[in-house]
């Protein structure tokens, strides 16, 4: 006798990183058939939607139109398929951004490093926060946690040429509420200096610092959900 | 070219502060880090710290902590080390060194501590 | 933080000899490795960089290279201004480190 349903996959459109008060969307996709979806923040119930007709209709989204440090925190979703419930979705992490101050990013050696060298970015903010961010832009976002008073360093390598990209920092005022993002910093990655053609095909870092996030564009949204559901929840909690 | 310009000498009594200076020409000062590196006469290089003068970001050797203090001034392209409550163990050359990679150094300060 | 053993702490050799001065780091620093010169008045000069990279302006004769932990130094045919003072230097981690330095002596 099954007790209840497969869990609904969370995402945010169009990221879980919101500016403050810009507009997000909290996905919550179930089965065709649910007759209700409830979103939960902070355990608590937030809202619901009751989508029509049900039988045609397998995803609702709630509208955030207005993002602030109070909508900032922790979501989760489930669904109804007459009186059996699902089990609830993985946690979805909204943070609120372009808070209060920016920080400056810089690299040692320097943007233009050599494969093979070691690499750390630093990350400095003068006003109060204790935890940095650093994050590369693309379709796999990698995000490191960094700590230190005014700055934290982040080191990387030996690095290959799957660490090139445009790297960004934020300080964390909370574990939802960031900065504004700091200049990006563009690291090339340039000729080989041993033989590195056994390099991996994406970058590894340290197991207990990197997680992998999916970060939506606006040029088109991943749904692979086995992929969406790898959202920030590891790295801020 | 990269030209790093250090003071030959410098002589102070022991228990005071100097500030050392490094002037930079021949590159964009603000794009690159600098450090700086002490040699005590017949023995090794250690390094003090580095700091990068279009972010402020500013790295230290522990050991150089509360001793060595980092400043830059972007308008004339020099950078400082300011040394503090000096004693004889402070008595060494002082480098200065462009670049992540310590690309090009400077001829390096004297600095004697003596009454 | 990581040690840079050098050695030997000197070396006399014979112009037109090969030398090799090796360091050993005592953690992983990849390929972030200097080798650099300083002359008796004090002067320091970068001859490698990326454990290999040849600085431009430096004679072909000096090379660099690695294997596992150690990196060397090499001096393919000793001339008369190579009888000074070399050290390493890992920029790979926080302090910076150099190793305790080279002498070399004209036999």
């Known amino acids: 006798q099954q007790q209840t349903l497969p869990k609904p996959f969370i995402w945010a459109e169009p990221h879980f990183m919101v500016p403050k008060e810009k507009q997000v969307t909290i996905c919550c996709q179930g089965n065709y058939g649910a007759v209700e979806y409830q979103l939960h923040f902070e355990g608590s119930l937030f809202a619901v939607d009751r989508p029509k007709p049900p039988e045609r209709i397998n995803k609702v989204q709630f509208y955030i139109p207005d993002m602030n440090s109070r909508m900032a925190g922790q979501y989760s979703c489930i669904y109804r398929v007459g009186e059996l419930w699902s089990e609830p979705s993985n946690l979805l992490d909204l943070v609120v951004t372009e808070m209060y101050d920016t920080p400056t990013l810089s690299v040692h050696p320097g943007p233009e490093v050599i494969s093979g060298e070691k690499v750390t970015f630093y990350c400095r903010l003068d006003t109060a926060t204790s935890m940095f961010l650093l994050l590369k832009e693309g379709r796999s976002s990698h995000v490191q946690r960094g700590y230190g008073k005014v700055q934290a360093e982040f080191p990387l390598g030996p690095v290959t040429t799957a660490h090139r990209g445009t790297y960004r920092c934020f300080g964390s005022y909370n574990n939802h509420a960031w900065s504004f993002p700091s200049e990006p910093v563009k690291l090339l990655v340039t000729g080989d200096i041993e033989n590195t053609s056994l390099a991996p095909e994406d970058p590894t870092f340290p197991a207990d610092t990197w997680g992998t996030y999916l970060l939506t564009t606006e040029t088109g949204l991943q749904k692979d959900h086995a992929l969406w559901d790898h959202t920030a929840q590891n790295l801020l909690r | 070219q990269v030209q790093l310009q250090q003071p030959g000498s410098v002589l102070v009594r022991p228990g005071a502060s100097v500030k050392l200076s490094c002037k930079a020409s021949g590159y964009t000062f603000t794009s690159s880090w600098m450090h700086w590196a002490k040699q005590r006469p017949g023995q090794g290089l250690e390094w003090i710290g580095h700091?990068?003068?279009?972010?402020?970001?500013?790295n230290y050797n522990e050991k150089f902590k509360g001793k060595a203090t980092l400043t830059v001034d972007t308008s004339s392209s020099t950078a400082y080390v300011d040394l503090s409550s000096l004693t004889s163990e402070d008595s060494a050359v002082y480098y200065c060194?462009?670049?992540?990679?310590?690309?090009?150094w400077g001829a390096g300060t004297t600095v004697t501590v003596s009454s | 933080d990581i040690q840079m053993t050098q050695s030997p702490s000197s070396l006399s050799a014979s112009l037109g000899e090969r030398v090799s001065l090796t360091c050993r780091a005592s953690q992983d620093i990849g390929s972030s490795l200097n080798w650099l010169q300083q002359e008796p008045d004090g002067t320091i000069k970068r001859l490698i960089y990326?454990?290999?990279r040849l600085d431009s302006g430096v004679p072909k004769r000096f090379s660099g290279s690695r294997s596992g932990s150690d990196y060397s130094l090499t001096i393919s045919s000793l001339e008369s201004e190579d009888f000074v003072d070399y050290y390493c230097l890992q920029y790979a981690s926080s302090p910076w480190t150099f190793g305790g330095g080279t002498k070399l002596e004209i036999k």
């Open positions: 990326a454990t290999s």
């Open positions: 060194s462009r670049g992540g990679r310590f690309d090009d």
């Open positions: 700091i990068h003068p279009n972010s402020g970001i500013s």
